[in-house]
Amino acid sequence: TQNKALPENVKYGIVLDAGSSHTSLYIYKWPAEKENDTGVVHQVEECRVKGPGISKFVQKVNEIGIYLTDCMERAREVIPRSQHQETPVYLGATAGMRLLRMESEELADRVLDVVERSLSNYPFDFQGARIITGQEEGAYGWITINYLLGKFSQKTRWFSIVPYETNNQETFGALDLGGASTQVTFVPQNQTIESPDNALQFRLYGKDYNVYTHSFLCYGKDQALWQKLAKDIQVASNEILRDPCFHPGYKKVVNVSDLYKTPCTKRFEMTLPFQQFEIQGIGNYQQCHQSILELFNTSYCPYSQCAFNGIFLPPLQGDFGAFSAFYFVMKFLNLTSEKVSQEKVTEMMKKFCAQPWEEIKTSYAGVKEKYLSEYCFSGTYILSLLLQGYHFTADSWEHIHFIGKIQGSDAGWTLGYMLNLTNMIPAEQPLSTPLSHSTYV
């Protein structure tokens, strides 16, 4: 008689990443009998919720349910009905909601309340919605990429299964850029982590890790741009802001009330003699870079060395995976190749920013003008943050790998978050067992 395949004994999990600019739903799948093995969980679906981040719904919380419907329906379609009730759903909100909470804890709670009520209406096992800390965001991002790269596996392989594997067990650092915050997380080399707030201790698969992490709130690409505009308008002589971070010929009117809406611009707030100002692009990388550097306070450091704003940063060590907006922006600019040196990236950015706006619009007709107009700033900001903020050099640039997906799963904090909450990363190395008897019939 012929062997019959048993029905797939698999489990599913759902994590919603409620970021500052958008929400994404991720569906993960793994073999039920291999929960504690490293590298068995993989992403089967990403559904990007259509619209802005949840913090934008603060004045219309009753509409959050509609906003989430489409992707939750997608999850209902992808996951077999028999598995719905045992599939956990987690929602983690990041820096956009941290900023809203700084403005009003009550409003942030109201948004999360409605999110919880909406997600509870689905047939899944809803486990809660919460604002995760910047430290968690950094840590879970680090766990995700190292899990996917097979760094926690004790079995050494003579072949490489992933593009960035250096066939050793040294972990990768994680660089995450969002719209409202940015995180840097890595294992320093025999270095004391001088500031306790930045120190994490993990025991994973029988090995101890002393990890450094920091999340810079207000230094995501969108909030950094608001900061830069608020800083520059202080010294503008009238309501025209000639801005080197936008293409020549680009024009946009900004409301002062919008500029000062975010807590990130409070330190630059002043009474201006106008309600609106006009950005006029002049497209100059060097001047843009200089303007961005003024957002990083490097004059004060109470430790042996700092990143910026008095935040401890140990010497960089090993390879780094740069994901989220680090990847999306560099991918758009066609700068993700391992072969592109830092000097070449700078050169390309100079050319890109200098291109006239009309030319850019023609070349990228399919891209929304709001996004398109900000790539010069975002690319320049990434270079400034990595080089001056985190102290990468032209030589260490080659240790940065711009990563979108690893083995088909998105790089980001969501997988690490789910692995942790479902207890799928054991502290000790699981005993290696022969093939499970359920593998064959």
């Epitope: 990403e46 559904c47 990007r48 259509k50 619209g51 802005p52 934008k56 719904f57 004045q59 219309k60 009753n62 509409e63 349910g65 509609i66 906003y67 419907t69 489409d70 329906e73 997608r74 209902r76 379609e77 209406n121 399919g366 891209v367 929304k368 709001k370 996004y371």
Partner: antibody, heavy 121, light 106 residues
Amino acid sequence: EVQLLQSGAEVVKPGATVKISCKVSGYSFTDYNLNWVKQPNGKNLEWIGNIDPYSGGTRYNQKFKGRFTITIDQSINTAYMQLNSLRSEDTAVYYCGLYGYDDDANYFDDWGQGTLLTVSS
Amino acid sequence: EIVLTQSPAILSPSPGERVTLTCSASSSVSYMHWFQQKPGKPPRLWIYATSNLASGIPARFSGSGSGTEYTLTISRMESEDFAVYYCQQRSSYPLTFGQGTKLEIK
């Protein structure tokens, strides 16, 4: 502002194939699902299916699965719907449309002007 | 699929009259959307998420309901309101429309 421009009216014979286009502008193409709706001579509206340009994933109403295919060409911001093995009951106005929340969380819903398809021998 | 049944199919109100259109769903939906359509034109979103007026829609229109029963109300009928009104649910796939209520001039 968001605009959806559909291809012109078509008169085709039963059994033939037709491809209707919907060119969108005024927003980032990958930001919203693009839906197709059928309306036979001013009667009921029927949802055919949609495509998510971000992932390329499609969904169909079971009733239209098989002969109807929704695709996109991201490079020219255009969605298509191909109808195969046409029958007289496919005669209708076909609309493309999209809906969702903009960057300021304002809800919007936009439709193309419609493409009249006549299937006749 | 969720079947939406609108009633009445046709209504002939006089200007100034209060008009109520109903939409019943075969199973519970979270929200209902309403569209207005005039001859030769695509449908236009009129009310979204049960009770929110779309941009530019006059305040004499309102929407309410929950679960399986939803209504669109016009407090005082005006001549420009004569059209066909459709309800639509977007809570689950396939998306479905009601068969429409036609408001016609007597």
